[in-house]
């Protein structure tokens, strides 16, 4: 079966939302004039070839913008990037495209997104507002890795 991406809105536990600024995703407090991006997520169709019990492997895109989140090394460190990519092209590939995949884990209302290409690295936002989304190995310290997802229909 061919799936369709699920539109969601994402905010962190400090009620900051994701906005696109100069092709970079940043987390800012939700205000009247802030227009958060809508995230599209779709499960990898090759789930049986990925690690069990780590979460649901998903691709994350920016709804209607042909941009997807991916992880790539910059020097020694994995970094979070936005790449021009159709999320359905990733979904339909004959193998999991690991650099674009994240294990989505849910605990109660909280979600985390762990890089499939770089296990142990999670999407995070700095505890200070107005900062770009990053990848971190350090959970629950200076960075927030727990997010809330709201399904949009």
């Amino acid at each position: 079966k061919s799936e369709m991406p699920q539109p969601v809105s994402i905010q962190d536990i400090n009620h900051r939302v994701w906005v696109l600024q100069d092709q970079i995703l940043i987390a800012v407090p939700r205000k009247d004039r802030v227009s958060p991006v809508t995230i599209s997520l779709i499960s990898c169709r090759h789930v049986e070839t990925l690690e069990k019990d780590r979460g649901n492997p998903i691709y994350l895109g920016l709804n209607g913008l042909n941009l997807c989140l991916m992880c790539a090394k910059a020097g020694d460190q994995p970094t979070l990037q936005l790449k021009e990519k159709d999320i359905m092209d990733l979904y339909n590939q004959p193998e999991p495209v690991k650099s674009f995949l994240f294990y989505h884990s849910q605990s109660g209302r909280n979600s985390t997104f762990e890089s499939v290409a770089f296990p142990g690295w999670f999407i995070a936002v700095s505890s200070e507002g107005g900062c770009p989304l990053i990848l971190t190995q350090e959970l629950g310290k200076a960075n927030t890795t727990d997010f809330g997802l709201t399904m949009l229909f």
Epitope: E48, K85, Q93, E95, A117
Partner: antibody, heavy 121, light 109 residues
Framework: QVQLVQSGAEVKKPGASVKVSCKAS????????IYWVRQAPGQGLEWIGR????????RYDPKFQGKATLTTDTSTNTAYLELSSLRSEDTAVYYC??????????????WGQGTLVTVSS | QAVVTQEPSLTVSPGGTVTLTCRSS?????????ANWVQQKPGQAFTGLIG???DRAPGVPARFSGSLLGGKAALTISGAQPEDEADYFC?????????FGGGTKLTVL
């Protein structure tokens, strides 16, 4: 530079097993997929299967399920193909290849030199 | 299981254009088959040419192009060079497994 170097030719008796190695250099096998393909004398290519060295998951062509076993040793950056219950029809050159995503698609970008396995009584 | 068929042999003149095709026994080849093309020159290792039907692998000369043509996957060599004399194999994806064709022996004469 990127290279896949395979083990040498093997001669085996029917019913025996063989293990072919494919040592990678110039890249980490955990960052890609390793495919195995064979070519019988005067024939086309046949896909055997593939392994994801990062987590060890495999896919096999139905024909090779139970016949072939794919493994890796990430500490030595080496992939292995083991074939069991060999028959004369398994006489072929066996190739490993890197199947990598670059930009917008997956490609077979690097191949081993091939290992001839001869099954003869 | 699907059978993938290629022309056993083709000949092209130097500088000429030739199209190799890849037919599926299950019907028309589509982009969902993610056609791959690989080349094997005599006495040399294989080289990947095309992935995803029409995406050239890094470093592959622009004279090689992939497409869909009349329900088949196609590899076109425009301005063939003597060094293009080789065996060419296509591979098509069917759900979670890959099937190779029998190969085309291309002579540049």
């Amino acid at each position: 530079q990127v290279q896949l170097v395979q083990s040498g030719a093997e001669v085996k008796k029917p019913g025996a097993s063989v293990k072919v190695s494919c040592k990678a250099s110039g890249f980490n096998i955990k960052d890609t997929y390793i495919y195995w393909v064979r070519q019988a004398p005067g024939q086309g290519l046949e896909w055997i299967g593939r392994i994801d060295p990062a987590i060890g998951t495999t896919r096999y062509d139905p024909k090779f399920q139970g016949k072939a076993t794919l493994t890796t040793d990430t500490s030595t950056n080496t992939a292995y193909l083991e074939l069991s219950s060999l028959r004369s029809e398994d006489t072929a050159v066996y190739y490993c290849a890197r199947y990598d995503y670059s930009g917008s698609s997956f490609y077979f970008d690097y191949w081993g030199q091939g290992t001839l396995v001869t099954v003869s009584s | 299981q699907a059978v993938v068929t290629q022309e056993p042999s083709l000949t092209v003149s130097p500088g000429g254009t030739v199209t190799l095709t890849c037919r599926s026994s299950t019907g028309a080849v589509t982009t969902s088959n993610y056609a791959n093309w690989v080349q094997q020159k005599p006495g040399q290792a294989f080289t990947g040419l095309i992935g995803g039907t029409n995406d050239r692998a890094p470093g592959v000369p622009a004279r090689f192009s992939g497409s869909l043509l009349g329900g088949k996957a196609a590899l076109t060599i425009s301005g063939a060079q003597p060094e293009d004399e080789a065996d060419y194999f296509c591979a098509l994806w069917y759900s979670n497994h890959l099937v190779f064709g029998g190969g085309t022996k291309l002579t540049v004469l």
